[in-house]
Amino acid sequence: GSERTCCPVNWVEHERSCYWFSRSGKAWADADNYCRLEDAHLVVVTSWEEQKFVQHHIGPVNTWMGLHDQNGPWKWVDGTDYETGFKNWRPEQPDDWYGHGLGGGEDCAHFTDDGRWNDDVCQRPYRWVCETELDKASQEPPLL
């Protein structure tokens, strides 16, 4: 495997992770793919300190994070445990609201204008944040 020791150009280093903040919007799945092609993942918020860091960089703009419940329970994209982990939902969220008229509920989490989290329709074109950890050996699949 290879090890990343410094952040790519235009990524921001913070607490041994690299972050990339988009300036345009994508559906959640497209944002997830974008991060994965860069050997990263949608941001996983594990502490109040990280929450404040991300919030400072994104400003008051709806922004996707790496949290969804498209397969049932809420899950972080990197496998971080949701139940025991950091949460910052808005009051009465997540609510899986069906009243938007777009079909289905709300399965993807985003930062709202005040930084707190909301669940929303995954197809909405929100900005997003990619994150990758420094000094973490990336696993290369065996060649067949």
């Epitope: 495997g1 290879s2 790519p8 150009v9 235009n10 990339w20 988009s22 300036r23 345009s24 919007g25 994508k26 559906a27 497209d30 793919n33 974008y34 994965r36 092609l37 860069e38 050997d39 074109p125 990336s138 696993q139 290369e140 699949p141």
Partner: antibody, heavy 123, light 107 residues
Framework: EVQLLESGGGLVQPGGSLRLSCAAS????????MSWVRQAPGKGLEWVSA????????FYADSVKGRFTISRDNSKNTLYLQMNSLRAEDTAVYYC????????????????WGQGTLVTVSS | DIQMTQSPGSVSASVGDRVTITCRAS??????LAWYQQKPGKAPKLLIY???SLQGGVPSRFSGSGSGTDFTLSISSLQPEDFATYYC?????????FGPGTKVDIK
């Protein structure tokens, strides 16, 4: 100077297999995602597959999903495309391409391409 | 999948002419669009990325514009080496689809 050199093309029967290689030089190979793009004779360009720099994440066009496998060996600076269950419609020149992105918007693009290798699927 | 269309399909022009090619996406792709030039028997060559950024080494007579769904590639004064086929490509979402191409030939 960035160079990409494809090899492994040739004539294969329908249902057969082939493995294409793309030898890269002139840049830090493991730092860049790579793609395969193909072009049927007299036709336009079709994106086939992409792989992240580490090789940990792969992406495919629906037309090849389940039949083609993209991989890379960063110790050898080489990209691969394993093609199984080949069909006549897979006949094309296959190009490997290096992906970069606009540092402001993040918009990806293919800045360097190999010369291509021809795959012909015919009985 | 995002469908890309180009117009015209082909254009006959003379050296010195201004040529404009249009590319349209079936849904908004921000400015996540690239333009490539391809000559017969050769690999594509990147001209424009992020809709309007000129790739290093590409002559300034090439320019790109647009955002959302409608984009254009312009060649301000066609040169003999510009006769080729031009493709647009969206990289907003997988699959990274190309337009069908526009062939620019000699009038």
């Amino acid at each position: 100077e960035v160079q990409l050199l494809e090899s492994g093309g040739g004539l294969v029967q329908p249902g057969g297999s082939l493995r294409l290689s793309c030898a890269a030089s002139g840049f830090t190979f493991s730092s860049y995602a790579m793609s395969w793009v193909r072009q049927a004779p007299g036709k336009g360009l079709e994106w086939v597959s992409a792989i992240s720099g580490s090789g940990g994440n792969t992406f495919y066009a629906d037309s090849v999903k389940g039949r083609f496998t993209i991989s890379r060996d960063n110790s050898k600076n080489t990209l691969y495309l394993q093609m199984n269950s080949l069909r006549a419609e897979d006949t094309a020149v296959y190009y490997c391409a290096k992906k970069d992105y606009d540092y402001v918007w993040g918009s990806p693009y293919f800045d360097y391409w190999g010369q291509g290798t021809l795959v012909t699927v015919s009985s | 999948d995002i469908q890309m269309t180009q117009s015209p399909g082909s254009v006959s022009a003379s050296v010195g002419d201004r040529v404009t090619i249009t590319c349209r996406a079936s849904q908004g792709i921000n400015n996540w669009l690239a333009w490539y030039q391809q000559k017969p028997g050769k690999a594509p060559k990147l001209l424009i990325y992020a809709a309007s950024s000129l790739q290093g080494g590409v002559p300034s007579r090439f320019s790109g514009s647009g955002s959302g769904t409608d984009f254009t590639l312009s060649i301000s004064s066609l040169q003999p080496e510009d006769f080729a086929t031009y493709y647009c490509q969206q990289t907003d979402s997988f699959p990274f689809t190309f337009g069908p191409g526009t062939k620019v030939d000699i009038k």
